[in-house]
C-alpha cells in the first residue's frame, strides 16, 4: 500500500569515505518527493534532507555522533505538492536501507605521502594524518584519531629502476626504511584496517619518489 | 571459512612452463595479499613472492626472479602462479597462503599444495 | 636479505618433555617473527606471531619469546601430536625468509 502514484525507494545504498557519508537511492523523482530518517538500533528516528527532488542525502552530521553504532535510515515518498497526503494505511510510503556501522565499514580514503627524507641509508617516509569529520571537543579527529592502533599503513617501495615492491608497515603515520646508497627509490601507501572483514584497504596513494620536491636528501 | 585450494601442478621438462591457480573462498583477495611458498622434496620452506590483488604490485625471491609471475583475478577470486624457464631445482610442492595485512599476523591461512616436477 | 639461523635442525624428545627451539635473525627485526608447524604431506599451521603470541585455537603449552635478535619456541609439555617439523619466520622485510626448520622426532 502507499500514496497514489508515488514509488517507494529502492537500492538504498550507504556512500562513505573516512565518515564523510551519504545514503543515495533510486529512482529519480518523477512527480514526487523524498524524506529521509535516521536511527541508531536504539534510538529515535530524525529527519533530514525533507522534501527533496534528490536521490541522495548527507547522514554525516549524525553518524559523527558515534561512529561505532549501527545506523538504520528509510526514505520516504511523498507525491509533490501534496506531502500531507498518506496512503491507504495513513502511512507514506518508505524502504529501509541496509544496517551501517561507520567504524566498521566506512571506506577508507586515498591516503597522502607528506614528506620523506633520506639520512645515508635510512629513509623517513611520513602519511599525512588526515582529518575526519568527526568532532571531539570541538575539534575535529584524524583518522589516527579515530583508528588509533587498528589502523596500520602499508609502504610500498621500490628503486626507479626495478619493478619489484618491498613493503613495510606501520601502525603509527611513519615509516623508517633501509635502502641502497645512491639508488632513487619510488613510494606508495595504503591504509588498512586488517580486523575487518570487508573494506580493509583503502586505494593506494599517489607515488612520489625521490629526487622530487616533496623529498629532502642528507647525505652523511 | 576460508580456504585456498591450489591446482595445476604435474610434470613438466625444463625449460617448460606451467600456471599454477589458487582458488580462495570465504574471503576477498582483494582485501588481503597472497603469497607463494615453495617446499622442494625432504627440504624447508622458501619464499617464492608475493601479489597485492588489490594494486597488482609483486615482489620476487631472487630464485625466481624474471622466470616467474604472480597475478590474480578479483573477480575469480584467485591468484596465479605463472612458472616459466622451470629447472630441476624448481621441483617443490608449491603453497599458496594468505597474509593477513597487519603488522602482527602473518600467513594465517594456507593452500594443501600442489606438487610440481620439472625432468625429462 | 635477513637470515633466520634455527637450531638445532632435529631432536629427539619424549612426550611430557618441555622442548626448546631457538632462531637468531641475522639483523634487527623487530618482534616481527612467525612459528609453523607442518606434519609430513601437509601444508604449514601458524602457531606463534608476533614473537610471543598465540594464534588463535592453537594450545596454551606452546609459547614464544624473544630476546633482542633470538626467538625461541617452547613447547611445555610434549603431546603426541606436537612431533613435527617447525619452523620460524622473519616479515620484518620484505623478502620474508624462512629457518631451515626443527623436526621434533619421538626418542
Known amino acids: 500500500s502507499g500514496t497514489t502514484n508515488t514509488v517507494a525507494a529502492y537500492n538504498l545504498t550507504w556512500k562513505s569515505t573516512n565518515f564523510k557519508t551519504i545514503l543515495e537511492w533510486e529512482p529519480k523523482p518523477v512527480n514526487q518527493v523524498y524524506t529521509v530518517q535516521i536511527s541508531t538500533k536504539s534510538g529515535d528516528w530524525k529527519s533530514k534532507c525533507f522534501y527533496t527532488t534528490d536521490t541522495e542525502c548527507d547522514l554525516t552530521d549524525e553518524i559523527v555522533k558515534d561512529v561505532k553504532q549501527t545506523y538504520l535510515a528509510r526514505v520516504f515518498s511523498y507525491p509533490a505538492g501534496n506531502v500531507e497526503s498518506t496512503g491507504s494505511a495513513g502511512e507514506p510510503l518508505y524502504e529501509n536501507s541496509p544496517e551501517f556501522t561507520p567504524y566498521l565499514e566506512t571506506n577508507l580514503g586515498q591516503p597522502t605521502i607528506q614528506s620523506f627524507e633520506q639520512v645515508g641509508t635510512k629513509v623517513n617516509v611520513t602519511v599525512e594524518d588526515e582529518r575526519t569529520l568527526v568532532r571531539r571537543n570541538n575539534t575535529f579527529l584524524s583518522l589516527r584519531d579515530v583508528f588509533g592502533k587498528d589502523l596500520i599503513y602499508t609502504l610500498y617501495y621500490w628503486k626507479s629502476s626495478s619493478s619489484g615492491k618491498k613493503t613495510a608497515k606501520t601502525n603509527t603515520n611513519e615509516f623508517l626504511i633501509d635502502v641502497d646508497k645512491g639508488e632513487n627509490y619510488c613510494f606508495s601507501v595504503q591504509a588498512v584496517i586488517p580486523s575487518r572483514t570487508v573494506n580493509r584497504k583503502s586505494t593506494d596513494s599517489p607515488v612520489e619518489c625521490m629526487g622530487q620536491e616533496k623529498g629532502e636528501f642528507r647525505e652523511i | 571459512e576460508v580456504q585456498l585450494v591450489e591446482s595445476g601442478g604435474g610434470l613438466v621438462q625444463p625449460g617448460g612452463s606451467l600456471r599454477l591457480s589458487c582458488a580462495a573462498s570465504g574471503f576477498t583477495i582483494s582485501g588481503y595479499w597472497i603469497h607463494w611458498v615453495r617446499q622442494a622434496p625432504g627440504k624447508g620452506l622458501e619464499w617464492v613472492g608475493y601479489i597485492d590483488p588489490a594494486n597488482g604490485f609483486t615482489y620476487y625471491a631472487d630464485s625466481v626472479k624474471g622466470r616467474f609471475t604472480i597475478s590474480a583475478d578479483t573477480s575469480k577470486n584467485t591468484a596465479y602462479l605463472q612458472m616459466n624457464s622451470l629447472r630441476a631445482e624448481d621441483t617443490a610442492v608449491y603453497y599458496c597462503?594468505?597474509?593477513?595485512?597487519?603488522?602482527?599476523?602473518?600467513?594465517?591461512?594456507w593452500g594443501q599444495g600442489t606438487l610440481v616436477t620439472v625432468s625429462s | 636479505d635477513i637470515q633466520m639461523t634455527q637450531s638445532p635442525s632435529s631432536l629427539s624428545a619424549s612426550v611430557g618433555d618441555r622442548v626448546t627451539i631457538t632462531c637468531r635473525a641475522s639483523q634487527d627485526v623487530n618482534t616481527a617473527v612467525a612459528w609453523y608447524q607442518q606434519k609430513p604431506g601437509k601444508a604449514p599451521k601458524l602457531l606463534i606471531y608476533?614473537?610471543?603470541f598465540l594464534y588463535s585455537g592453537v594450545p596454551s603449552r606452546f609459547s614464544g619469546s624473544r630476546s633482542g635478535t633470538d626467538f625461541t619456541l617452547t613447547i611445555s609439555s610434549l603431546q603426541p601430536e606436537d612431533f613435527a617439523t617447525y619452523y620460524c619466520?622473519?616479515?620484518?622485510?620484505?623478502?620474508?625468509?624462512f629457518g631451515q626448520g626443527t623436526k621434533v622426532e619421538i626418542k
Open positions: 608476533s614473537a610471543s
Open positions: 619466520q622473519q616479515h620484518y622485510t620484505t623478502p620474508p625468509t
Open positions: 597462503a594468505r597474509d593477513y595485512g597487519s603488522i602482527q599476523v602473518f600467513l594465517d591461512y
